[in-house]
Interface confidence: low
């Protein structure tokens, strides 16, 4: 004998207390596939988490984070706090990147400049918190005849020192 | 096992300027920054600036900003800290340390090199 | 730039704890290391991050940042922990202070 219950569609539950017939959802759950015998409780968007898609019947909630926050975590799971580029996140926060370090983003972490003279350059940009450096040809590619390039003073941004 | 090497005593006359040395062995010399700190006689720790030596480029203290440079030697694993125009009150023991890769603490620390100005 | 302040004495008895103080603006948004020094020999570190103790420091030596404060206690102090006591930070500029120093007396 099939199970009545199979006939139950997405957004209705099988409800043994009624004979196995198909009851709509309650307010605030779902189901989003047939032949469930229960109802999922909606995802509720509380706090830092926001509101993406609303719930209904068939499918969860969807959330996301409010302004300064971004999401960690597939389907949004945690939300963690937006720095500034040229900062990363710590216990303590956000923090400026170490001297020799840049984040060009508002989310992840401090990364180390580009090391021109492994590739054989020489430094054309000097690196900040927030960009690379920008690597030109080699000191030897510079020959007298040649147009030179420069490289700018190093970078002194008021209270960045090295370790 | 890491160790900081710095270079012997010096006496120095007003005016002039001193240039101390410290080389670093036992570890990856390009990938820490070394700093120099210094202890006037019975005074406390003063950062004077520091280098990464891989990068280069020093930043310092803006009390010694214009008298102080830092520079490093990866052939050598060496770091040098020049103080120019030296006073009496620069008299003090000068130490290199380095910090340790994931905080801000000097986690080792040269054995100190006493310059002593005096006319 | 953050300015650190340490009283400039502290006396313990033996066996007993010592606590070192160590103020300044909202300094437990940065983090605290501390540094023991002897009469004539270079500092040593004892606590870095705020808390966490180097290999080979023993465990009576703790540490703690939050608000305006940091601070280093000593359990159990023993007569071999008289020496000199400075904080220092670093804000994430790494921009390095110390404070001025805290001389332990172990009575």
């Known amino acids: 004998i099939q199970d009545s219950c199979s006939n139950c569609p997405a957004g209705t539950f099988c409800d043994n207390n009624r004979s196995q017939i198909c009851s709509p959802c309650p307010p605030n759950s779902f189901s989003s596939a047939g032949g469930q015998r229960t109802c999922d409780i909606c995802r509720q968007c509380k706090g830092v988490f926001r509101t993406r898609k609303e719930c209904s019947s068939t499918s969860n909630a969807e959330c996301d984070c409010i302004s300064g926050f971004h999401c960690l975590g597939a389907g949004c799971t945690m939300c963690e706090q937006d720095c500034k580029q040229g900062q990363e996140l710590t216990k303590k926060g956000c923090k400026d990147c170490c001297f020799g370090t840049f984040n060009d983003q508002k989310r992840g972490i401090c990364r180390p400049w580009t090391n021109c003279s492994l590739d054989g350059k020489s430094v054309l940009v000097n690196g900040t918190k927030e960009r690379d450096v920008v690597c030109g040809p080699s000191p030897a590619d510079l020959s007298p005849g040649a147009s030179s390039v420069t490289p700018p003073a190093p970078a002194r941004e008021p209270g960045h020192s090295p370790q | 096992q890491v160790q900081l090497v710095q270079s012997g005593a010096e006496v120095k006359k007003p005016g002039s300027s001193v240039k101390v040395s410290c080389k670093a062995s036992g570890g990856t010399f390009n990938s820490y920054a070394i700093s120099w700190v210094r202890q006037a006689p019975g005074q406390g720790l003063e950062w004077m600036g520091g280098i990464i030596p891989g990068f280069g480029t020093a930043n310092y203290a803006q009390k010694f900003q214009g008298r102080v440079t830092i520079t490093a030697d990866e052939s050598t694993s060496t770091a040098y800290m020049e103080l120019s125009s030296l006073r009496s009150e620069d008299t003090a023991v000068y130490y290199c340390a380095r910090k340790n890769e994931e905080d801000g603490g000097f986690d080792h620390w040269g054995q100190g090199t006493l310059v002593t100005v005096s006319s | 730039d953050i300015e650190l302040t340490q009283p400039p004495s502290v006396s313990v008895a033996p066996g007993q704890t010592a606590r070192i103080s160590c103020s300044g603006d909202?300094?437990?948004?940065?983090?605290a290391s501390w540094y023991q020094q002897k009469p004539g020999q270079a500092p040593v570190l004892v606590i870095y991050?705020?808390?966490n103790r180097p290999s080979g420091i023993p465990e009576r030596f703790s540490g703690s940042n939050s608000g305006n404060t940091a601070t280093l206690t000593i359990s159990g102090t023993q007569a071999e922990d008289e020496a000199d006591y400075y904080c220092q930070t670093w804000d994430g500029t790494l921009h390095f202070v110390f404070g001025g120093g805290t001389k332990l007396t172990v009575l």
């Open positions: 991050d705020d808390s």
């Open positions: 909202n300094l437990g948004d940065y983090y």
